[in-house]
């Protein structure tokens, strides 16, 4: 066995949007670090057969199966999948190892199965078996985390009822606003379910599994902060737990906090208080109001009062079903070719939405930002000045929302011409949509100024690029016009563009562009 090659089999997972079938190549994509597939010699098999660990791939995911061979001399190879041979192109890496790759783009059911790689080196022949299966994600769920008080302790437990079981982490920040962004140095993450340190400025709990990541912020009223111009609002669905934290800092311990709902003190057992001294010897008190399962009658103004601070309130609204409130009327925009512009949707929603921006059947990531007035906004700026129809789609499990936008880019027409035996056609995608003129070029009119008044038919049509309009003009050819040059011109407020066509017998026509 000493002349057997040293081989390593790896899986590379790609984050890509391209679609294709298996490619035996090294394909440029953003990749995660390789995972060892532990190729092991298959016992009791005829010939030398290595077996890689089975790989599970999500539908539409892209992967590379790769073999690194430490063997002297050249190697040749062949991939076989479902009795079909696939091209194989080995290359050598910087360590002079032979590298053979199979790229599977946009995994589908038909691409699952056994991939056999036959390798022939100067010393030996051997086979490597890869098994690729589709991950069964039908039962997967990812639910937003919620809070519970830990029995007999002043601590919060974060719970997310998800499949597969998620990793739960607390995300803590003691700064204000922008500095509490996820990757900020001010943010501390604790991968545990129970949190004892409940005095921080910003407290969130996040749960993540293969479906993604969902977070819930601990709703907080800070009596030392200037109140927002609009009353903070908290939405919950019937049956969900309510948690509101009131926080206040004072120079000494001589102050107390209380919660009221619609001017009535909360019942015993639906609040608890904690206090601590901060580094500068000031006293921090927090008072939690909680309801383990809210009903419609828990709706109202929750007011936190202090003997040493102005009181502040929040409006808690209990709804039967989630919602997305936004105006769904379509919007049209007209911009210059180099003008900076972003689409924007302002909405109020509960639970938090998942959203996408789509253009020409391609989905783009969607970011949302919370505003001070309880609304959120999602902007899309990555249109690259491509005209057409853009779609914003949002959903949150209870509600769906779609809004259409049309983007028109102001530009001078560009004319494309084609001709057949009986007609000549010109089209243009300039904006505003151009108007057309046809001129005849002759001995009498060498500059092509003679108008063609008849036989012209203009129309506008939707182009393949979704939502982009194209204007076209067709000239029906009479026998008398054959052999002449004609000129079609498209013009709008930004300029004119023309194309000259020789009207002769059918076949390829020469065009002379002329701006």
């Amino acid at each position: 066995n000493q002349d057997l090659p040293v081989i390593k089999c790896v899986l590379i997972n790609h984050k890509n949007n391209d679609s294709s079938v298996g490619k035996s190549s090294s394909y440029p994509m953003v990749s995660e670090s390789p995972e060892d597939l532990g190729c092991a010699l298959r016992p009791q098999s005829a010939g030398t057969v290595y077996e890689a660990a089975t790989v599970e791939v999500d539908v539409s995911a892209s992967i590379t199966l790769q073999v690194l061979v430490d063997t002297p001399g050249n190697i040749s190879c062949l991939w076989v999948f479902k009795h079909s041979s696939l091209n194989c192109q080995p290359h050598f890496d910087v360590q002079n190892r032979g590298v053979v790759s199979m790229v599977i783009l946009k995994m589908t059911e038909t691409q699952a199965g056994e991939y056999l790689l036959f390798i022939q080196s100067e010393a030996t022949n051997y086979t490597i078996v890869f098994t690729v299966s589709i991950r069964n994600t039908l039962l997967f769920t990812l639910r937003r985390p919620y809070f519970r008080k830990m029995e007999n302790q002043d601590a919060l437990v974060c719970i997310s009822e998800s499949v597969p079981e998620p990793i739960v982490e607390w995300v803590l920040c003691d700064s204000q606003g922008e500095s509490c962004k996820e990757e900020s140095p001010a943010v501390v993450k604790k991968e545990e379910k129970v949190l004892h340190e409940l005095f921080g400025t910003d407290i969130r709990c996040c749960a993540r599994n293969e479906l993604g990541r969902e977070c819930t912020r601990l709703f907080t009223i800070d009596l030392n902060q200037t109140p927002q111009t609009t009353l903070p609002q908290l939405f919950l669905k019937v049956g969900e737990p309510l948690w509101i934290r009131c926080k206040a800092v004072h120079v000494n311990h001589g102050f107390g906090l209380t919660w009221e709902l619609e001017n009535k003190a909360l019942e015993e057992g639906s609040y608890f208080e904690m206090s601590t001294y901060s580094t500068n010897r000031t006293m921090i008190r927090i008072l939690f109001a909680f309801v383990s399962s809210v009903a419609r009658n828990d709706t109202g103004y929750y007011t936190c009062s202090s003997s040493k601070h102005p009181s502040q309130s929040a409006l808690v609204t209990i709804v039967e079903k989630g919602f997305i409130n936004a105006t769904n009327s379509s919007e049209d925009y007209e911009i210059d070719q180099y003008e900076e512009f972003c689409f924007s949707v302002r909405f109020k929603a509960y639970p938090q939405i998942r959203c996408t921006w789509t253009f020409s059947r391609k989905a783009f990531p969607c970011e949302q930002k919370a505003l001070d007035d309880g609304y959120s906004v999602s902007k899309f700026c990555n249109h690259k000045h491509q005209p057409g129809e853009y779609i914003f789609h949002a959903e949150n499990g209870d509600a769906q929302f779609t809004k259409m936008f049309t983007l028109n880019i102001r530009r001078k027409p560009q004319v494309l011409a084609e001709a057949s035996a009986s007609q000549a056609s010109c089209s243009s995608d300039g904006y505003p949509l151009p108007s057309w003129t046809w001129k005849k070029c002759s001995d009498k009119s060498p500059n092509c100024t003679e108008d063609i008044p008849e036989g012209v038919w203009n129309r506008k049509a939707n182009r393949k690029v979704f939502g982009q309009w194209v204007s076209s003009s067709t000239l029906n050819m009479s026998e008398a016009m054959k052999g002449f040059l004609v000129k079609c011109c498209a013009y709008n407020s930004l300029g004119t563009s023309c194309e000259t066509i020789l009207l002769n017998s059918p076949g390829p026509f020469p065009f002379i562009q002329d701006s």
Partner: nanobody, 125 residues
Framework: EVQLLESGGGLVQPGGSLTLSCAAS????????LGWFRQAPGKEREFVAA????????YYADSVKGRFTISRDNSKNTLYLQMNSLRAEDTAVYYC??????????????????WGQGTLVTVSS
């Protein structure tokens, strides 16, 4: 870090049944692909069955297909192997195994990150 502890092994007659359990400690049990391997005296350790980290997909060696069933209960942090129609050639030490990836199924020994200490199954009349 995951610790694995097998139980349920013992002596059984040919044609009989046995259920092996593997209790795992560690917070993120459901993040691991799990499997069972076995090693008969004087032989190499071989793959028996594997289950994806979610429990959605299962994989079996040809020699046990239709007789053995692998399952997992993420809420109890436990892996199971239900063995029916046992044969003398199933006699071996059975090991519980966990991989370190959610994409790679533990169907070969090199991808195993954590092993249990093993439980002996003897099939004999």
């Amino acid at each position: 870090e995951v610790q694995l502890l097998e139980s349920g092994g013992g002596l059984v007659q040919p044609g009989g049944s046995l259920t092996l359990s593997c209790a795992a400690s560690g917070r993120t049990f459901s993040s691991y692909a799990l499997g069972w391997f076995r090693q008969a005296p004087g032989k190499e350790r071989e793959f028996v069955a594997a289950i994806s980290w979610s429990g959605g997909n299962t994989y079996y060696a040809d020699s046990v297909k239709g007789r053995f069933t692998i399952s997992r209960d993420n809420s109890k942090n436990t892996l199971y192997l239900q063995m029916n129609s046992l044969r003398a050639e199933d006699t071996a030490v059975y090991y519980c195994a966990a991989g370190g990836s959610t994409r790679v199924v533990v169907t070969t020994t090199p991808v195993v990150k954590y092993w249990g200490q093993g439980t002996l199954v003897t099939v004999s009349s």
